[in-house]
């Protein structure tokens, strides 16, 4: 039977969402509760480390939300963005693999605002490379496991 | 030759889209016309049943649209949402695997409004489990086969 | 060792983005620089040609953006759309496999506007068929390789 291919589906750790409106790397993800799982990949410091060379499909789903019960937004014009970043440890460097998002005007008479971003793509990854997620406005993240997550699964070897 | 892996790509049955603005389960999908297809999975009562344990990539694309020729919207503040739901028959329970969407203000001087949601993720599914799609505001769904669909394909066995 | 499965990840050629606001086919993509890559598929005239029958997962990520420094928008009501199109050469015909997007009001006091679309789905493709990308408002496309791309990878054979 062939060796199980690497995969991960990581869900946001609600207890460790940073505050702020600047772009931040999300550094705390679950890997073993609810829908979260990992196999033949490693999670360290919020980065998903590749242990096996290959072509992988990477994806991320990021939800932002605000309800007026938590107060008002200090600015009505928001950039709600996600960046899927590849870091090479051997040659310390970071590169955006995928980005998505939208500018939003969350003023108005609505008591609730919501917006989700989904990105996905097929990438060549080498053992030792790491995938991380950066977002703007982390304090607006939806902490549900069905809302804010990212993942990867190996599709094929590098020939 | 290895047994063909399970997959499905299901497109909305335009004739059976429910009306209303509340959250509903979409219960009628095509599986054998146009782009719709299914293999080693079963469609029953709008739910996609898993017949083979495995890790699957699940996805959904949901489009909402409104043209002023069809009349005015009852409310200008809309929550346009999709939920991908897993139901276990053995232990009757439902859980959201993925969600996406946006709040929208579809007032204004534009005669046409459109919005699409895409979600995707990698999940462990057991034989007998079912996947279904819930949406808000089903009366605004775009009934085209390229617009509103969901699907799954098996990536690997559970070891 | 099994033959490497076909795949492609194609990123927008910034130098060849057409102008205008009408729906156009994007005809220039990179296949061999940065994240762009192709194997056992062919790129010709901006169309991704299938060389091997199979079931493929197709995806596209399209980002639109506008900064006031580049001038004013001629219209504040925009339809920002993507269509993933399959063309059969044997029987000359085109069909939309997937679509996504949103209507947007990019007026207001914000100096920067951004919006991304992601679509993905599982399709049966035959050798000789071609996949292309159509967008509205191509002059608003974000030319970054992490922003505007599409791709495909073969998941399994047609039995």
């Amino acid at each position: 039977k062939p060796e199980a291919q690497p995969f991960a589906h990581l869900t946001i750790n609600a207890a460790s969402i940073p505050s702020g409106s600047h772009k931040v790397t999300l550094s705390s993800w679950y890997h073993d509760r609810g829908w979260a799982k990992i196999s033949n990949m490693t999670l360290s410091n919020g980065k998903l480390r590749v242990n096996q060379d290959g072509f992988y499909y990477l994806y991320a789903n990021i939800c932002f939300r605000h309800h007026e019960t938590s107060g008002d937004l200090a600015t009505e014009y928001l950039q709600l963005m996600v960046y899927v970043v590849k870091t090479s440890i051997k040659i310390p460097s970071s590169h955006n693999l995928m980005k998505g998002g939208s500018t939003k005007n969350w003023s108005g008479n609505s008591e609730f605002h919501f917006y989700s971003i989904n990105v996905g793509g097929f990438f060549k990854l080498r053992a030792g490379e790491e995938i991380s997620i950066q977002v703007s406005n982390p304090s607006l993240l939806d902490p549900d496991q069905d809302a804010t997550y990212f993942g990867a699964f190996k599709v094929q070897d590098i020939d | 030759k290895p047994e063909a892996q399970p997959f499905a790509h299901l497109t909305i049955n335009a004739a059976s889209i429910p009306s209303g603005s509340h959250k509903v389960t979409l219960s009628s999908w095509y599986h054998d016309r146009g782009w719709a297809k299914i293999s080693n999975m079963t469609l029953s009562n709008g739910k996609l049943r898993v017949n083979q344990d495995g890790f699957y990539y699940l996805y959904a694309n949901i489009c909402f649209r409104h043209h002023e020729t069809s009349g005015d919207l009852a409310t200008e503040y809309l929550q346009l949402m999709v939920y991908v739901v897993k139901t276990s028959i053995k232990i009757p329970s439902s859980h959201n695997l993925m969600k996406g969407g946006s709040t929208k203000n579809w007032s204004g001087n534009s005669e046409f409004h459109f919005y699409s949601i895409n979600v995707g993720g990698f999940f462990k599914l057991r034989a007998g489990e079912e996947i279904s799609i819930q949406v808000s505001n089903p009366s605004l769904l775009d009934p085209d086969q390229d617009a509103t669909y969901f699907g799954a394909f098996k990536v690997q066995d559970i070891d | 060792k099994p033959e490497a499965q076909p795949f492609a990840h194609l990123t927008i050629n910034a130098a060849s983005i057409p102008s205008g606001s009408h729906k156009v086919t994007l005809s220039s993509w990179y296949h061999d620089r940065g994240w762009a890559k192709i194997s056992n598929m062919t790129l010709s005239n901006g169309k991704l040609r299938v060389n091997q029958d199979g079931f493929y997962y197709l995806y596209a990520n399209i980002c639109f953006r506008h900064h006031e420094t580049s001038g004013d928008l001629a219209t504040e009501y925009l339809q920002l759309m993507v269509y993933v199109v399959k063309t059969s050469i044997k029987i000359p015909s085109s069909h939309n496999l997937m679509k996504g997007g949103s209507t947007k009001n990019w007026s207001g006091n914000s100096e920067f506007h951004f919006y991304s679309i992601n679509v993905g789905g599982f399709f049966k493709l035959r050798a000789g068929e071609e996949i292309s990308i159509q967008v509205s408002n191509p002059s608003l496309l974000d030319p970054d390789q992490d922003a505007t791309y599409f791709g495909a990878f073969k998941v399994q054979d047609i039995d």
Epitope: S19, G20, D72, T75 | - | -
Partner: antibody, heavy 126, light 103 residues
Framework: QVQLVQSGAEVRKPGASVKVSCKAS????????IHWVRQAPGQRLEWMGW????????KFSQKFQGRITVTRDTAASTAYMELRSLRSEDTAVYYC???????????????????WGQGTLVTVSS | EIVMTQSPSSLSASVGDRVTITCRAS??????LNWYQLKPGKAPRLLIY???SLQSGVPSRFSGSGSGAEFTLTISSLQPEDIATYYC?????FGQGTKVEIK
């Protein structure tokens, strides 16, 4: 330590305007929002509006919309609240209060008023 | 618009007594509720934020509890300096106040 010091008591005739100042010290003024809250004799506290001292964004209670202006001078670390078309029922003690949310760390104005000014009595009488 | 209702509107208790003030919201507000102390001629003081978090510098005899639509402020052992009017607050809405006096 954090302090908000308001301008002194004012007496106005109906129809006139009043402008109350609130000088902040002991923290980075631009990183917080300032709220204005009033209390009329025998009444509950009443929220009037806020200003994000960093970007100047404002939000007001519907009740005061069109009559209130809130501004700030970041160089002077001072917020101002002007109320126009005064009537007798505007007689109240007017407070400025700092929102506890640091705008560097977040973008939610949380309505936790962690520091208050001493209050300014505005009397409207003919 | 959310309405906050406090009870009682006033109370009289002895030094050392345990005092409880209730605040109800007209709809669920999760834990977004604050308590303030107001003494005549002085600046109001934040006691409790987020329903149960004690503001820095506030004596530990003050505590808050509750979530959803029902909340309480408790003074475990009333002191003479606690004579004041207490207000609950959720974002833009304040309760009508509870006046606490010493018997």
């Amino acid at each position: 330590q954090v302090q908000l010091v308001q301008s002194g008591a004012e007496v106005r005739k109906p129809g006139a305007s009043v402008k109350v100042s609130c000088k902040a010290s002991g923290y980075d003024f631009s990183n917080y929002a300032i709220h204005w809250v009033r209390q009329a004799p025998g009444q509950r506290l009443e929220w009037m509006g806020w200003i994000n001292a960093g970007n100047g964004n404002t939000k007001f209670s519907q009740k005061f919309q069109g009559r209130i202006t809130v501004t700030r001078d970041t160089a002077a670390s001072t917020a101002y609240m002007e109320l126009r078309s005064l009537r007798s029922e505007d007689t109240a003690v007017y407070y400025c209060a700092r929102d506890s949310s640091n705008m560097v760390r977040g973008i939610i104005i949380a309505y936790y008023f962690d520091y208050w000014g001493q209050g300014t009595l505005v009397t409207v009488s003919s | 618009e959310i309405v906050m209702t406090q009870s009682p509107s006033s109370l009289s208790a002895s030094v050392g007594d345990r005092v409880t003030i209730t605040c109800r919201a007209s709809q669920s507000i999760s834990r977004y509720l604050n308590w303030y102390q107001l003494k005549p001629g002085k600046a109001p003081r934040l006691l409790i934020y987020g329903a149960s978090s004690l503001q820095s510098g506030v004596p530990s005899r003050f505590s808050g509890s509750g979530s959803g639509a029902e909340f309480t402020l408790t003074i475990s052992s009333l002191q003479p300096e606690d004579i004041a009017t207490y207000y609950c607050q959720h974002t833009r809405a304040f309760g009508q106040g509870t006046k606490v006096e010493i018997k």
